[in-house]
């Protein structure tokens, strides 16, 4: 049975040309952690697997670092980075736990970070 | 249970549009973070993705269709269609509707409808 | 397009037997692949998905491994029911690919 529940940054902003770190926490669960994924809608950003280690895609090898922890950061943003991200982590035995975010970059210097929020 | 069921004319000859119907049951089709595909498979079993509507509505094609294909969607009636035109005897095939997830793996898949393109 | 090949069409086993299929990804596609079993007059069934984790009701026989450009998919003792084609599948990026196909058979 899952039990445990994944803990995003929840909707945020950030500034054209700045940076952003994408972080998840899975909660309320024993269950071991084998993988984490960062994808977009169509296609993956990176892996962090705890036997291989991190793995970024070529396509974002330029201004996306592994970390903190199993979280990502996002450099050089555009607006074309604007939409959805999600976190996957495999785990042992329970299965795979789904996390959202959603990133909107912002033209101006009027970027907040959005309330923290949670997905069973 | 989630369940999809593919529905279609069966023959059409070439240079004509096809129109398939996906009718999907337990489970919303504007249900968050899902996408709905087809796929096709051809006689000797190769197995291509056409593309998929998201939750939101966005669409994405395989780019070696993208010029003849049009997906869409009813969602008081939770279905999606495919639509191919300019069809010829290659396009014959089974064609599946499935749910695609985040991690673009299909977890659920419809039975499968024919189409035989011939004059 | 990443390119999925698998090189043998047909694998003959005998039931209780190991068998291992074999998928090469035309670049590294890191552990994104997935692994499908489809039988005769039946759609395709996902078994295994991010290289080497089982789908939900999988049975345990069925396993996955593989980093990079090559994966293996293993059915460590054939049972009659496991007669069918199995297909790997890349989900790195779009648009999604499949490999051919792999026919386990009974000698």
């Known amino acids: 049975m899952m039990t445990g529940t994944i803990e995003t940054t929840g909707n945020i902003s950030a500034e054209k040309g700045g940076s952003i770190i994408l972080q998840c926490h899975l909660s309320s669960t024993t269950a071991q952690v084998t993988q984490v994924n960062w994808e977009q809608q169509d296609q993956l950003l990176a892996i962090c697997n705890a036997d291989l280690g991190w793995h970024i895609s070529p396509s974002f090898k330029d201004r996306v670092a592994p970390g903190p922890g199993l979280g990502l950061t996002l450099q050089s943003l555009t607006v074309n980075d604007t939409g959805e991200y999600f976190c996957i982590y495999h785990t042992y035995p329970d299965g795979t736990y789904t996390g959202r975010i959603f990133l909107e970059v912002l033209e101006s210097s009027v970027a907040e970070h959005g309330a923290r929020f949670q997905i069973p | 249970d989630v369940q999809l069921q593919e529905s279609g004319p069966g023959l059409v000859k070439p240079s004509q549009t096809v129109f398939l119907t996906c009718t999907v049951t337990g489970i919303s089709i504007t249900t968050g973070n899902y996408k709905w595909s087809w796929i096709r498979q051809f006689p000797g079993n190769k197995l291509e993705w056409i593309g998929y509507i998201y939750y939101s509505g966005t669409i994405t094609y395989n780019p070696s269709l993208a010029s003849r294909t049009t997906i869409t969607r009813d969602t008081p009636k939770n279905q999606f269609f495919l639509e191919l035109s300019s069809l010829t005897a290659e396009d014959t095939a089974s064609y599946y509707c499935?749910?695609?997830?985040?991690?673009?793996?299909?977890?659920?898949w419809g039975q499968g409808t024919t189409l035989t393109v011939s004059s | 397009d990443i390119v999925m090949t698998q090189s043998h069409k047909f694998m003959s086993t005998l039931l209780g037997d190991r068998v291992s299929i074999t998928c090469k990804a035309s670049q590294d596609v890191s552990t994104a692949v997935a692994w499908y079993q489809q039988k005769p007059g039946q759609s395709p069934k996902l078994l295994i998905y991010?290289?080497?984790y089982r789908y939900t009701g999988v049975p345990d026989r069925f396993t996955g491994s593989g980093s990079g450009t090559d994966f293996t998919f293993t059915i460590s003792s054939v049972q009659a029911e496991d007669l069918a084609v199995y297909y790997c599948?890349?989900?790195?990026?779009?648009?999604?690919?499949f490999g051919g196909g792999t026919k386990v058979e009974i000698k």
């Open positions: 991010s290289a080497s």
């Open positions: 499935a749910r695609e997830t985040v991690l673009r793996v299909f977890d659920y």
């Open positions: 599948q890349q989900h790195y990026s779009s648009p999604r690919t």
